[in-house]
Each structure stands twice: as C-alpha cells, then as structure tokens.
C-alpha cells in the first residue's frame, strides 16, 4: 500500500455576513469581542467548507479580522489536497464550490445557517501559500484595520515600539480605490514595506514592495485595483522614531479613455498618464487613448521617461505594463534612459494606443508625452537611433545609439565636410576667415542662419549657425545675439599662471568648489550659476551623504587646513541629482547644488562657462583638471588645491581600454602613459578647457576610472554637453525657488 | 632647448651586438615615453617600440621582439637600444624620439647608422 | 597591425603649386595620425598631429584633413624648401605604424 501524495494548498479570502454589524471592538485583535467573534465565525467557516466536497481534504482554518460591510470576516483555510486534483481545485473552483453550498437549501451539516446569513456574491477566494500566512501571523501582535470613508486623508499610526513587523488591514467603500501615501522620513534605514493588492500578505497579489529607506522615491503614492489593501512593515534596525509616515485615501476610479486631435505642429503637444498619477498605476489599470494626426506627413512620437517598451512573445506576461499599439504588443520596462516610441502612419484615423496592467505588481506612473514627426526627416540635421526613437548626433565620434550606427558610414567623423570634394577639416577651420577646403565652402554662410545639425550652435530664436563653438567668444553670430549672452563667465581672476606646476594660484580656477561635510573635503565641484554649483552624483551615493543639509560648500578656497579672505562658505538648500544616474555603471554622472543663497562675484569666486550641447571638444585638446584629491592611490587628500594638464582622448580609443563600458554621457582624458590624473577626492571636479577667446569651458566632471594616473587607463569624467539639457532644465525651473 | 642626442656610427660583425644610446636634455625622460624607429633606404621608418623611464615598461612591435632590448637610466637621462644576433637586414639608420600623452614623436635623436659586415 | 599605405612614392610638383599627398589607413584610427617630413641626411621633423594639429612652429600653408579613412596633407602653395619626403604614422594603437613616404620633387 502507498500512500496518497498530498500537497496544503491556502486560501485566503473574505466573506461578508448580513445578519452582523462590525464594530470597534472587532478592529481590535486584543478584545474579548474579537476573540469570541472569530471562534465562531471560524466554526462557521469550518462548517461551510464541510458541507461540500472539500470537507474531506480540510485542514485547518483561521478568521484573522474584521471589516465593516456589515460584518466582513477576512479568512485564510488550508486543504489537503491530493497531488493529482491540485490543478483542479483552483480558487475558481473552490468559491463556486462554496458559493453553490451558500445557495443550496440542504439542511445538512448545515448549522452555521441558522447563526450568519452569508452574502454568497460577496465571497472572494484568492490563491495563497503557506509563506502569506507565516507573514501574516509574524504581523498579528501589530494587526491594525481601519477603514476609509470618502473625501477623508487617514494618517495611519506608525509601528509600535516593541514589535519588528505590522499589518495595516485598509478598507474602504466597495466602488471606490485605496490609495496609500508612504513617506520617508529619514535618509537610511532598512526597513521594509510591502503592499498588497488583497486584505492580506498574498505574495501573489503584492503590488510593491520597498527596501530600505527610498531616496529615489522619498514620497510613493500607490493604488489598489479596488477597496482592499495590505500594507506590511518589517523592521530593519532598532530606532526610536518610525523612519516612514504612512495615510490612506479613498478615490473614485479615474477614467483614462481619451480622444485626442493632433495640431499640424513638431513641438511637444501634450501628454498621457495612468490615473493619478504620478501616483503607481492600479493593477486594474486599462486605459486607451485615441489619437487622431492632422495627415499622412506626420508619425507620431511618445516620449517616455525613464521606461521604454519592447517587443515580448505573446506567452509572456508583461510585468510592468503592457501596450497594445496598432495590434503591435509591446511590453513596458523601467530603465535609466529615455525613450521614444516612434508610429508611422498608414491610415488617416489615428492611432489607438491601449495600456494595461497584466499582474498586481505595478510600478510608478507612467507619463508620456506626444508630439508629431515630420515621416520623410524625423531628424532634421541628427541621426533617428531605431533602438530607443531618439535623434542623436551623428559623425561625431561618439556612439550614441546602441548598435553605433550613428557613427557608421561617416564621411567626415567629427569634422567639416568640404563641399566640393567630401575631405574633412577640422572643425576649429570652419568660419575662421581662412578658407580651407578647395572652394572655400568652409567659410560660406558663415554670416547666416544655416540647417541645424550635429555641430553647428543653436541661437535662442531656434535658428542655426555654421561656425562651431561660437559661445562667448566676443563676436555676435546669432542674429539675436544669445551666443553672447550669460557670458559672464570662465575667465580667471589673475592672469599669472604658473604654467606645468602642480599647485595652483589664487584666482587662477575662481569656479573651484571644495564639497565639504562637517569640515571634511568629500568632493570638487564648480560654480556654474550664481546660485548653482555642479557635481558627481556619486558623491551622494551613500545614505548618509544623501541629505542637502549635510553639505557646506566653499568657493575660493585655496587650502584645506587653513581659510583667507577670497573664500566664502555656502549651505545647500536643495541637490538635485540626475533621474538616470546609475551607480553601477556611473552614467548619468551629475548632480546640481543649489546654495542658500547668491555668491557675489570676486577676482576668486566667479562661474566656469558652459558649452551648448552642440560645442566641441577635440580629442587630443589639453585640458585642466583641478582638486584636492590624492596625489596617489591610496593617498591622503591634498591640502593645496593642485592642478594637472590631460589630454582628450577619442571616445573610442578609451571605450576599448574600458572594455567598452564607456557611455556616450562619458569622455576621456588623461596621459597615456598614467601619472597624470584625477583621484579620490577630486570626484565632482571641474574638467576645463581654454577656448581661444581666453574663456574656460566645463567639458567634463571628474567621475571614474581604474585606480589613478595607471597606464593605458585614462580618466573618465561626465561629459557635460551630452547632460547640458537636464543642467539648463533644472537651473530654469528652480531659477525663482529660494 | 629639447635636443636627443644619439651615439656615433656602428660597424658591427654578423652575430654580434651593439647598443646605442640616446641622451636627452631641455627634458626630463621619465615625463615622456622614449622610441626607436628604422629607417631603411628603400623600406622608409619602422617602429621598434618605446619605454616609459619611470617604471622601465616596454612595449614593442612584433618583428622586434626579442631582437632589440629598450633601457633606461634615468639618473643619466639616457635610454638605451641594444639590437643583437645582427644580420645584414639590421643595417639602418636607427632613431630615437619621444612623446607624451597620447601625441605621436615630437622630437627625434639626429640617428645613428650601424652598418654589418664581416 | 594597422596598416597605412601610401599610394605615390613621388609627386612631381611646381613652386607655387598646391598638392595634396595622401595616406590610406587600413581600419579606423579616428583622427591619430601624424605627417613628418624628412630632408635628406636629416631626422624627420613632425608637422601635423592628430590629423589637422599643425604643430608648433609649422607653416600655415600645411594643413592636415581627412576623406573617409584617407588622410590628407595639402601645401597650399608649394616653397623650394618644401622638397623632402612625407610620412603618415597612426598614432592611435600600438604597435605604431608608417606609411612608405612620399617624395615630393620639382617638375
């Protein structure tokens, strides 16, 4: 004889009961109440599962709270099945099972009739494993129920001292949404919140679960598909405050079906979003926005932040939400990049455009916006990178498409093409008033708006001139004259340069900035605004270092051990670091410093010009590269601010000394044979170049490499003009935020 | 003034060895790498390899391995090329010359012409 | 090894005149090439660096361009003086490479 093989399969679930009305008491596990309320109604239940055919595999059961509605009871039961029926007996099966007895008029075993008036449509069954119920009963001596009325914000109490996990059982009118607030309080904890589109801890029905103190989201709002949400705490380290605040809200369903008409114009149009947002979409999320485009000339582009889409086979679920466009399913993913969605048009009707959540597990709102493309030049003057839809430079010797394909079949890579016989000068030659192709063609037009493109400057009123790099250089060539304006900036406050020396003088670098926490140089950084200084991300990579109110920062400074009347000292009153800085592989290297209040100008404090994102650094320019950091691996950090002159190196030559981790967001410099570099201590410092007008530019700030000054290794640092349209974003939305 | 200054003419046997030197001044050679180049009537320049003086790392082109040994003494602001088991092939003019950062030679020795003969 | 070839071993040219030698290189070396000039009996002497760098002190009338992966070395206006064999150099990998020269002669 064998013995039947039998698995415990768990359910979970809720039941409402008509003949019973909750109240307080039943809120609270602790009461008397309670106690004597669920032995019964876990007889009742007990009872309800004996009376059908799954009388035979029950196991054990538990009623494990109350809710209004009249009375709602929140169960979980485990039955014994046999392997063979496991596949057979799935929620589904198991409600009707028990809905079918609920509405039967037998009479046998039957007692728990005469006692609850079960509401059988109310019964929901929800698959559920032994781990949920582990969770859950590790949460029942912090067990708190509330339910939400409408138009009401419910603050929820936090955690109690002396427990180390807590379940919020939240509830609210059965036609409306729960919506959690969690809001961090303290930069580094780890602890962790997890929440659950069901009453309980279902791993299957989680929507999100957050470890640790979030600095990307100190602030999430998230949705259930309906009235009934868990939230689980665990906790990570002994604190005597609750490192998070949580409040509750219940909210009609938001419709997302929209019918939109597209205007005959390429600039930005508007934009779609999932309900609430920037709230987390719902698990029950659909929506479906229709488009309609003036004509056949124009494709339309969604530009998405930080999530892209992909094709995915159609046995696989999408798992951060799925996108029907044109019968064309496309899977969401976060990522740190952007992204475009680009939709030619066939047909003159539009486009419907349908997204969906497929699984409870959500993620952040998804935005996108929408704008028209011209389908016979999607991008004027740029290469259009069929990866991510995005325009990205072309022949300019950086591969800003994935597959590099911007950088293929390149007459001239990251020079001027000649006219009249395709050779290539370098662009310095262009517009300089000494011809150099055999025609002349590099000094036509140069008094001229011309087609807007790689490297040619981009005046304020949107039109284009030839000449490269023609910023601040003394001369209007911008008919409106904006390449000349806020240019008060990268010259030095004394013109004595100690020239191949390693200590700098004062005034010689007056856009130096020494990033400092309780009187420890961490980092560099450079005065680029008078009330902005630019940096590392990296340097906030920590927890403890995440917080703008740590931070001082002096501008001026010559030494570290000792101060002089040219310094001047500033708090932080906001950091913004850059939404695609990804540490592991340190793109997006960048962050920006607004200090509490403007620094006046001086002979030693004064701003380092910015380049336009189409400006041009040429490979094999000498630079400087200015900090306190290490004068060798390993080493203490400098007291004097030191100085060293590096070579740019072509993007290629270094993303093959990188192995190819090298991003379009980075450049090289440094000295092939080593010693001449940047170090720790320098992260976030300035990487300037001389233009001939005498100014400095910021090329690059300094953010990785292998060691320091190693042979054949150079200096990575972020490549300002490929960051130059978040930087001038920021300063210009926070500009009037004090 | 930067100048290299290279050994005189070699007249050397079939077998044998020979070392030439290569002094620097207006310079410090372990700021800059130190090459050798050949020159042949007929065949134009050949690089030989370099050296980084500071840490006495070389790097040379694969027909030479083995043939020529590139060394430095910092302390005379010198680098040295010995060639050896010298065959008519390795009759040239021989230069040195120097660069840094990632910029091709700048300067170069005036050269030294060894001839092999029995 | 990158190779760079040289296509003309001598060019005939006129004072006065403009010409242009060229280098072919056998795969990408961005813009890391050098133009030398060597006279008879003399070492070469560098004249253009990274493809369009004239170095210190070189004529202006050496200029350095690029058409595909040919670079070019154009005299706008040829001197006497200017007589000499031209190399290209990659300067880009190791181990560095020469073209074969070009000798630059009076017609």
């Known amino acids: 004889y064998k013995a039947e093989v039998t698995v415990s399969q768990v359910y979970s679930g809720s039941l409402r009961v008509l003949n019973r009305h909750f109240s307080q008491d039943l809120g609270r596990r602790e009461s008397i109440a309670f106690r004597s309320e669920s032995a019964k109604a876990q007889k009742m239940l007990q009872e309800l599962v004996a009376s059908t055919r799954l009388g035979t595999y029950y196991n054990s059961s538990s009623v494990y709270s109350f809710g209004e509605g009249p009375l709602t009871c929140f169960f979980w039961f485990i039955l014994d099945i046999p392997e063979y029926q496991r596949l057979t007996l799935s929620p589904e099966v198991v409600r009707e099972l028990l809905v079918d007895e609920l509405l039967s008029n037998s009479s046998t075993l039957a007692s728990y009739k005469t006692e609850y008036e079960v509401d059988p449509e109310g019964l929901v069954i929800l698959e559920a494993s032994v781990n949920d119920i582990v969770v859950l009963n590790s949460t029942l001596g912090c067990y708190r129920y509330s339910y939400v009325n409408p138009g009401q914000v419910l603050p929820l109490k936090g955690p109690d001292q002396q427990t180390t996990s807590c379940l919020w059982h939240l509830q609210g009118p059965e036609d409306l949404m729960i919506k959690v607030r969690l809001e961090w309080t303290r930069v580094d904890c780890r602890d962790r919140v997890a929440m659950y589109d069901a009453a309980g801890p279902l791993e299957k029905r989680l929507i999100t679960s957050v470890y640790g103190c979030s600095r990307q989201e100190p602030v999430m709002e998230v949705l259930a598909s309906g009235s009934v949400m868990a939230v689980v705490w665990k906790k990570g380290m002994h604190s005597y405050y609750d490192p998070f605040l949580l409040s509750v809200k219940s909210v009609a369903f938001q419709d997302c079906q929209v019918n939109l008409t597209l205007e005959g114009r390429l600039d930005t149009q508007g934009f779609l979003r999932t309900p609430y947002y920037p709230s987390y979409y719902s698990p029950s999320t659909h929506c479906s926005w229709h488009l309609t485009v003036p004509s056949l000339d124009y494709g339309l582009a969604l530009w998405f932040d930080a999530y892209a889409l992909r094709r995915q086979k159609y046995n696989r679920l999408c798992t951060q939400g799925q996108w029907m466009i044109q019968n064309r399913r496309l899977c969401g993913f976060r990522t740190l990049q952007p992204y475009a969605e680009r939709i030619p048009m066939v047909a003159s009707d539009g486009v419907t455009i349908n997204f969906t959540s497929q699984i409870s597990l959500t993620g952040p709102g998804v935005q996108v916006y929408y704008s028209l493309y011209n389908q016979s030049d999607p991008c004027p003057g740029e290469f259009l990178c069929s990866v991510n839809g995005l325009c990205v430079p072309a022949c300019d010797g950086i591969k800003d498409c994935p597959n590099g394909l911007d950088e293929r079949n390149c007459v001239c890579r990251a020079m001027f093409q000649c006219q009249e016989d395709s050779t290539c000068i370098s662009l310095p030659r262009v517009c300089d008033r000494q011809p150099d192709c055999l025609n002349g063609s590099d000094e036509e037009q140069c008094q001229e708006g011309v087609p807007c493109g790689t490297f040619t400057f981009q005046c304020e009123d949107r039109s284009c001139v030839k000449k490269p790099n023609p910023e601040c250089d003394g001369q209007s060539d911008c008919r409106d004259g904006s390449d000349e304006q806020h240019c008060d900036c990268g010259l030095q406050g004394l013109s004595s340069r100690i020239v191949g020396g390693t200590v700098s003088s004062e005034g010689e670098w007056p856009w130096q900035a020494s990033l400092q926490i309780r009187g420890r140089h961490i980092c560099g950084g450079a005065l680029i605004a008078d009330r902005w200084v630019i940096t590392a991300a990296h340097c906030f990579q920590e927890d403890s270092m995440a917080s703008p109110k740590l931070w001082t920062v002096f501008l001026g400074k010559m030494r570290q051990n000792s101060r002089w009347p040219g310094e001047v000292s500033f708090k932080v009153s906001r950091l913004f670091l850059h939404p695609y800085h990804e540490e592991d592989s340190h793109d997006y290297d960048v962050a920006l410093l607004q200090l509490d209040h403007p620094v006046v100008y001086s002979a030693t404090v004064r701003p380092v010009c910015l380049p336009a994102r189409s400006h041009f650094f040429e490979p094999g320019q000498h630079c400087w590269i200015t900090g306190w950091g290490a004068q060798r691996e390993g080493g203490p950090v400098s007291n004097t601010l030191q100085k060293v002159d590096v070579q740019l190196v072509p993007q290629d030559l270094c993303s093959e000394a990188y192995r190819y981790q090298v991003s379009p967001r980075m450049l090289c410099a440094g000295y092939r044979k080593g010693k001449k570099d940047a170090c720790q201590g320098d992260s976030g410092g300035p990487l300037v170049c001389r233009e001939p007008s005498g100014r400095w530019f910021l090329a690059g700030l300094v953010s990785w490499g292998l060691g320091c000054g190693r042979p054949n290794f150079f200096g990575v640092y972020t490549r300002v003009t490929r960051v130059i349209n978040w930087i001038q974003q920021v300063l210009t939305h926070h500009h009037h935020h004090h | 003034e930067v100048q290299l200054q290279q050994s005189g003419a070699e007249l050397v046997k079939p077998g044998a060895s020979v070392k030439l030197s290569c002094t620097a001044s207006?310079?410090?050679?372990?700021?800059?790498?130190i090459h050798w180049v050949k020159e042949r009537t007929e065949q134009g320049l050949e690089w030989i390899g370099r050296?980084?003086?500071?840490?006495?790392?070389?790097t040379y082109a694969p027909q030479f391995q083995g043939k020529a040994t590139i060394i430095p003494d910092t302390s005379s602001n010198t680098a040295y090329m010995q060639l050896s088991s010298l065959t008519s092939e390795d009759a040239a003019v021989y230069y040195c010359a120097r660069s840094i950062y990632l910029d091709p030679m700048d300067y170069w020795g005036q050269g030294t012409s060894v001839t092999v003969s029995s | 090894d990158i190779v760079m070839t040289q296509s003309h071993k001598f060019m005939s040219t006129s004072v006065g005149d403009r010409v242009s030698i060229t280098c072919k290189a056998s795969?990408?070396?961005?813009?890391?090439v050098a133009w030398y000039q060597q006279k008879p009996g003399q070492s070469p002497k560098i004249l253009i660096y990274w493809a369009t760098t004239r170095h210190t002190g070189v004529p202006d009338r050496f200029t350095g361009s690029i058409s595909g992966t040919t670079y070019i070395l154009t005299i706008s206006s040829v001197q006497a003086e200017d007589l000499a064999l031209y190399y290209c150099q990659q300067h880009y990998s190791t181990p560095y490479t020469f073209g074969g020269g070009t000798k630059l002669e009076i017609k």
């Open positions: 795969q990408d070396v961005t813009t890391a």
């Open positions: 050296i980084d003086p500071e840490d006495g790392e070389t």
């Open positions: 207006g310079f410090n050679i372990e700021d800059y790498y």
